[in-house]
Interface confidence: medium
């Protein structure tokens, strides 16, 4: 017993040591070494049956969905899927895990967030990190050069998520992508149109779509004097401009990231600008930027993009923002991100955007990474951040104290007297066969009041009441739960009457 206590103390101390090293940002090797020691000690300790230490919970960064949350989720998915289909997309699915090799080298610094699986019969596997890389692998594997597809599925990231803000380790992504060689900016404009259509339909508040181009970023950093090795890290600083002032961003770039102050100043001149097509035109006149081939290409494409966005009627939702610098390594052209606009109590207390609710861009080189001959398939796409949207919709409904129906039942088959279970079973079966969503209470002789109460709680609009008299007369009493008005309906007309009242098509097409 004393031996166990001593071991427990060692585990505690070693745990504190590991935490300390992590806080001090010690080297990965040292941390790994100390973690291994900790695991060894824990293994020595073994299970302790005397202590019921197991806490019943979902793993970190995951959650269960209640029927209420699922109802919200299905409504959101319905809006998204209808929009994707309206734009002519097909649907695909891919495995939840991929060969580790498929995902390696596609995400830059974010690769450390990939979940690796333990050995599965020789293959090194990882859970998918997004839906884009598996899509590129699918195109290369099937030698496809042309497809417009959507894919809604869960992805996995070993992040430290702020779940209150709708961030998780397991979460849904809703992706729409167009692959193929097309005239410039037409598919890109459609992706932005889709993004705006979905966010408008969801009615989650005012939003803005920031647009930039990877080539403009590359060109801008090149003429400002940022070395290739610093590109990624400077991008991540610049990307904070929507949350903090330029002063703070500059301090980070110079103080923490070793950028020369004059280089930072040159970057500041560019990234503190946003606007519409007029800013694109202004930058096309810029003596330095217009001399950079990459930047010039990007600006030319953005000018064209704005023309199409105007034709699509969404140019007022788009802001060309030179500080938009986030994104994965695979983007090659236009990048965009939709942010919800909020109203902080005081300026400077918190950022304007509650965070990205959708993002996307052009990635012309990703499929080529999987092709033995390096053949490229140009792609552009978008991803809707549904988890964040679920959180927003849930919060809004809670604030409005709105009741959400968690079932779609149209009618409850009820009885007013005892000994009518057989009749209820016969009737509910008739309704099911006719495509009516119907329920009954699982009791032989339920009280009518209990049946009506169940309808009110579940939001079921109609009750079909069977009584002895009704059986003799060949009718069913159809009662509206909200108005409480009752009518006798001939049994053969019941299906049609329920469909008429609930707005369901009269044939199951």
């Amino acid at each position: 017993m004393a031996e166990r206590a001593a071991l427990e103390e060692l585990v505690k101390l070693q745990g504190e040591r590991v935490r300390g090293l992590k806080q001090q940002k010690a080297s990965a090797e040292l941390i790994e070494e100390e973690v291994a020691k900790l695991l060894k000690l824990k293994a020595q300790l073994g299970p302790d049956e005397s202590k019921q230490k197991f806490v019943l919970k979902t793993p970190k960064g995951t959650r269960d969905y209640s029927p209420r949350q699922m109802a919200v989720r299905e409504k959101v998915f319905d809006v998204i899927i209808r929009c994707f289909k309206r734009h002519g997309a097909e649907v695909i699915d891919t495995p939840v895990f991929e060969l580790k090799e498929t995902l390696m080298g596609k995400y830059g610094e974010d690769s450390k967030l990939i979940y690796d699986l333990k050995d599965q019969g020789g293959e090194l596997l990882s859970l998918r990190y997004d839906l884009t890389v598996p899509f590129a692998r699918y195109l290369a594997m099937n030698k496809l050069t042309n497809i417009k597809r959507y894919h809604i599925a869960k992805v996995y990231r070993r992040d430290n998520p702020a779940m209150t803000r709708g961030r998780y380790r397991e979460f849904y992504q809703c992706d729409f992508d167009i692959a193929g060689n097309f005239d410039p900016m037409i598919p890109d404009a459609e992706c932005l149109k889709i993004m705006c259509e979905i966010l408008s339909s969801l009615q989650i508040g005012d939003f803005l779509v920031k647009v930039n181009d990877r080539r403009i970023l590359d060109g801008m950093f090149a003429i400002c004097g940022v070395s290739d090795s610093k590109f990624r890290t400077i991008c991540s600083s610049v990307d904070k401009l929507d949350k903090v002032s330029w002063e703070e961003v500059k301090n980070e770039m110079v103080g923490e990231k070793g950028l020369a102050p004059e280089v930072a100043d040159r970057i500041g001149d560019y990234v503190q600008q946003h606007g519409g097509v007029s800013l694109v035109e202004q930058l096309l006149q810029d003596p330095k930027l217009s001399q950079n081939k990459q930047a010039l290409e990007g600006l030319g494409d953005l000018k064209l993009l704005f023309e199409y966005l105007t034709l699509f009627g969404i140019d007022d939702k788009i802001s060309f923002d030179l500080s938009l610098a986030r994104g994965l390594d695979y983007y090659t052209g236009v990048i965009y991100e939709a942010v919800l606009l909020q109203t902080p109590a005081q300026a400077g207390e918190e950022p304007l955007g509650v965070g990205s609710v959708a993002a996307g861009g052009r990635y012309d080189g990703l499929v080529g990474m999987f092709d033995p001959k390096g053949r490229k398939v140009p792609c552009v796409g978008l991803s809707i951040g549904v988890e964040r949207i679920f959180s927003i919709v849930e919060q809004r409904l809670e604030a409005l104290e709105e009741k959400i129906r968690t079932t779609e039942t149209q009618v409850l088959v009820a009885s007013a007297q005892k000994k009518l279970l057989e009749e209820r079973l016969k009737l509910v079966s008739e309704l099911w066969d006719a495509g009516i969503k119907a329920e009954l209470l699982y009791k032989k002789n339920p009280k009518l009041l209990n049946q009506l109460q169940y309808c009110e709680e579940a939001g079921i609009p109609l009750v079909a009441i069977i009584g002895e008299q009704e059986l003799k007369d060949g009718v069913i009493k159809l009662r509206s739960v909200t108005s409480r008005e009752e009518v006798d309906v001939r049994r053969e007309d019941l299906v049609e009457e329920i469909k008429r009242r609930t707005g369901q098509p009269l044939c199951i097409c």
Epitope: L208, G275, L352
Partner: antibody, heavy 120, light 107 residues
Framework: QVQLVESGGGLVKPGGSLRLSCAAS????????MTWIRQAPGKGLEWVSY????????NYADSVKGRFTISRDNAKNSLYLQMNSLRDEDTAVYFC?????????????WGQGTLVTVSS | DIQMTQSPSSVSASVGDRVTITCRAS??????LAWYQQKPGRAPKLLIF???SLQSGVPSRFSGSGSGTHFTLTISSLQPEDFATYYC?????????FGQGTKLEIK
Amino acid sequence: QVQLVESGGGLVKPGGSLRLSCAASGFTFSDYYMTWIRQAPGKGLEWVSYISGSNAYTNYADSVKGRFTISRDNAKNSLYLQMNSLRDEDTAVYFCARYVYQVVAIGDYWGQGTLVTVSS
Amino acid sequence: DIQMTQSPSSVSASVGDRVTITCRASQGISSWLAWYQQKPGRAPKLLIFAASSLQSGVPSRFSGSGSGTHFTLTISSLQPEDFATYYCQQAKSFPYTFGQGTKLEIK
């Protein structure tokens, strides 16, 4: 605290020139875009020009393009507006303001203004 | 250029009143809008940015709303120091244009 003080205004004949200055204090001048905004007597406000933190970037309203030049000296914490070929319609109070990019382009701090009168 | 139109051009009100000023943009500007207050012989003072965000130090009786092309500035309970001219300004694209102003006078 943030302070902006304009100077250099006065009476000038049409076709003449004038140079306005704005002395800034209370913040890291070189980290901010700066702007000139004007207001004709009894009229509304008009954004004239802006300049980026390190002098590289300038922009002008069409009404002054080719005639006005905005510049700055970060070592002296000063902003300037060189006004050439002045016209009657340039008569206004000229304000210098700190232009804040974060969230929207706005003037979050303004000077008290200097009056420019163009008249023969 | 984006045109900004304010209404009314002047309004008379009493201390304690609720006042609303409207600003319309000739094209959609999302939430890229600011409101300023200007007193005679003084520089404008920033009240609201991003259509509805209150500038630090500005009393909470001032609030802004709207997006796209239609915006409002509301003063929930007028104070003696609020009598001034109010301007809206679009910040979507340069040249950043102002409304013609709304003069708030004592009734």
